[in-house]
């Protein structure tokens, strides 16, 4: 086991694409570097033009490869991926159903936006609101990673602290990523502020994206309890009877 | 200390526009929000709308339409600009100072000015 | 838009007497309300932010209470100074909404 719980599982035999997806049947790690804990983690991704749809694209390989470093499923570590501007646009609800290839498909495929304006205030009131809602795995950490390179007007950010208390009170971690020179610097170090689980990472551009991901996925990581062990199935007892 | 001071017209004819002017001292306009509230004679007051320290506004979706907050922060000036006045506008207007920012929720109005008095009469 | 009903409208105290005006709302407000004192001028002064917070230099004397939809403002010792007219404001929603005000005099 790597530090900070990364778990480096056996390698499964892939599952051939015309197999339905069943969740015992995982489909193997693509990387050494693997979480596998108990965790809901939501990516929100800033879709500003703050970021240049070549930029955005390198954002978007960063979502993948954290995707193939963790353990996926329904069990172990879900997944939500939302797109905002000045709404928000979900692109992987937690509660999908699917094999971690095509949510990584999913995740690729998002489109980019680039709006004069990225509202973090309106993707938190909307995560708080219908991502975590409601709690249907409270066993689990729940971790937001904000991936924001922009700036919110401050009429928008209005009710900014309102919903950094409502995820405080539902034990929602959120690891704000600043991504270049706007990113709204005020509002993470407020991120900051509210838990101390809350850590910030200022990164100078995308580019530091992949530089930092291992450190972000260890943080995160390190955040959420371990799965259970699979119970194994009960052990069919043999009676051999002696011939009398 | 915080000061905020108005200076209107006083008398304005029905059908025409109000302009008011509100200068502040003992504060920066980028880092506080300034409101306007009005209150027409023997009644209560009425929130109209703000702007942040960012030049963003709010407005009461009752007068949207026809007001307009704007601000000069290099002379500490802002001002209310409200059209097709009728004579239910006539009110004392007052500018507030509003700590509205990224980092605070409690959207008291602490310093107030004075208030200018406006007649809306042919 | 969040109606605010100040209750009563007016009210003759002496005083030293203690003193309490009541604000409630049409909906729950989450104690984001505050009181501002009117004096016979006009000058208009903040008293309490957040249902409960004493603004800088308010006297002691000044408290505020309340939750969900009823919220209420207390002066515990009626000072000459204090007669003025009483208006609470819900920041909840927008638009920010005020109450009609309550006018206190002295017997």
């Known amino acids: 086991q790597e530090p900070g719980g990364l778990v480096v599982p056996p390698t499964d035999a892939p599952v051939s694409s015309t197999t339905p997806y069943v969740e015992d049947t995982p489909e193997p790690p693509l990387h050494n570097f693997y979480c596998s804990k108990l965790l809901d983690l939501v990516f929100l991704l800033d879709g500003s033009y703050r970021l240049s749809e070549a930029e955005f694209e390198v954002l978007k390989a960063f979502v993948v490869g954290t995707m193939e470093r963790l353990h996926i499923s329904q069990k172990r570590i879900r997944v939500a991926v939302v797109e905002y501007h000045d709404g928000s646009h979900a692109y992987l609800e937690l509660r999908a159903r699917k094999r971690p290839s095509e949510l990584r498909r999913i995740a690729s495929q998002i489109k980019y936006v680039g709006s004069q304006l990225a509202s973090t205030s309106e993707v938190l009131k909307y995560t708080l609101f219908q991502i975590f809602g409601k709690i249907d795995r409270p066993e689990a950490s729940r971790v937001i990673l904000l991936l924001t390179a922009s700036q919110e007007p401050q009429r928008m950010a209005r009710y900014f602290t309102r919903y950094l208390q409502g995820f405080k009170k539902k034990k929602v971690i959120l690891i704000p990523v600043g991504i270049g020179p706007h990113a709204n610097l005020k509002q993470i170090r407020l991120i900051e502020k509210q838990a101390p689980e809350n850590k910030a990472f200022l990164l100078s551009g995308v580019d530091e994206l992949e530089q930092r991901r291992d450190e972000i996925i260890n943080y995160l990581c390190d955040l959420a309890p371990e799965a259970p062990a699979p119970s194994k199935p009960p052990q069919v007892a043999h009676i051999t009877v002696s011939p009398g | 200390q915080v000061q905020l001071k108005e200076s209107g017209p006083g008398l304005v004819a029905p059908s025409q526009s109000l302009s008011i002017t509100c200068t502040v001292s003992?504060?920066?306009?980028?880092?506080?929000?300034v409101d306007w509230v009005r209150q027409p004679p023997g009644k209560g007051l009425e929130w109209l709308g703000m702007?942040?320290?960012?030049?963003?506004?709010d407005y009461n979706s009752a007068l949207k339409s026809r007001l307009s907050i704007t601000k000069d922060n290099s002379k500490s000036q802002v001002f209310l600009k409200m059209n097709s006045l009728q004579t239910d506008d006539t009110a004392r207007y007052y500018c507030?100072?509003?700590?509205?920012?990224?980092?605070?929720?409690?959207?008291?109005?602490?310093?107030w000015g004075q208030g200018t008095s406006v007649t809306v009469s042919s | 838009d969040i109606q605010m009903t100040q209750s009563p409208s007016s009210l003759s105290a002496s005083l030293g007497d203690r003193v309490t005006i009541s604000c409630s709302a049409s909906?729950?407000?989450?104690?984001?309300l505050n009181w501002y004192q009117q004096k016979p001028d006009g000058a208009v002064k903040l008293l309490i932010f957040?249902?409960?917070s004493l603004h800088s230099g308010v006297p002691s004397r000044f408290s505020g209470s309340g939750s969900g939809t009823d919220y209420s403002l207390t002066i515990s010792n009626l000072e000459p100074e204090d007669i003025a007219t009483y208006y609470c404001?819900?920041?909840?929603?927008?638009?920010?909404?005020f109450g009609g005000g309550t006018k206190l005099e002295v017997k």
């Open positions: 909906q729950d407000i989450n104690k984001y």
């Open positions: 404001q819900q920041y909840e929603k927008l638009p920010w909404t």
């Open positions: 957040y249902t409960s």
């Open positions: 507030v100072r509003d700590p509205a920012d990224y980092g605070n929720y409690d959207y008291a109005l602490d310093y």
């Open positions: 702007i942040w320290g960012d030049g963003s506004t």
């Open positions: 003992g504060f920066s306009l980028t880092d506080y929000g």
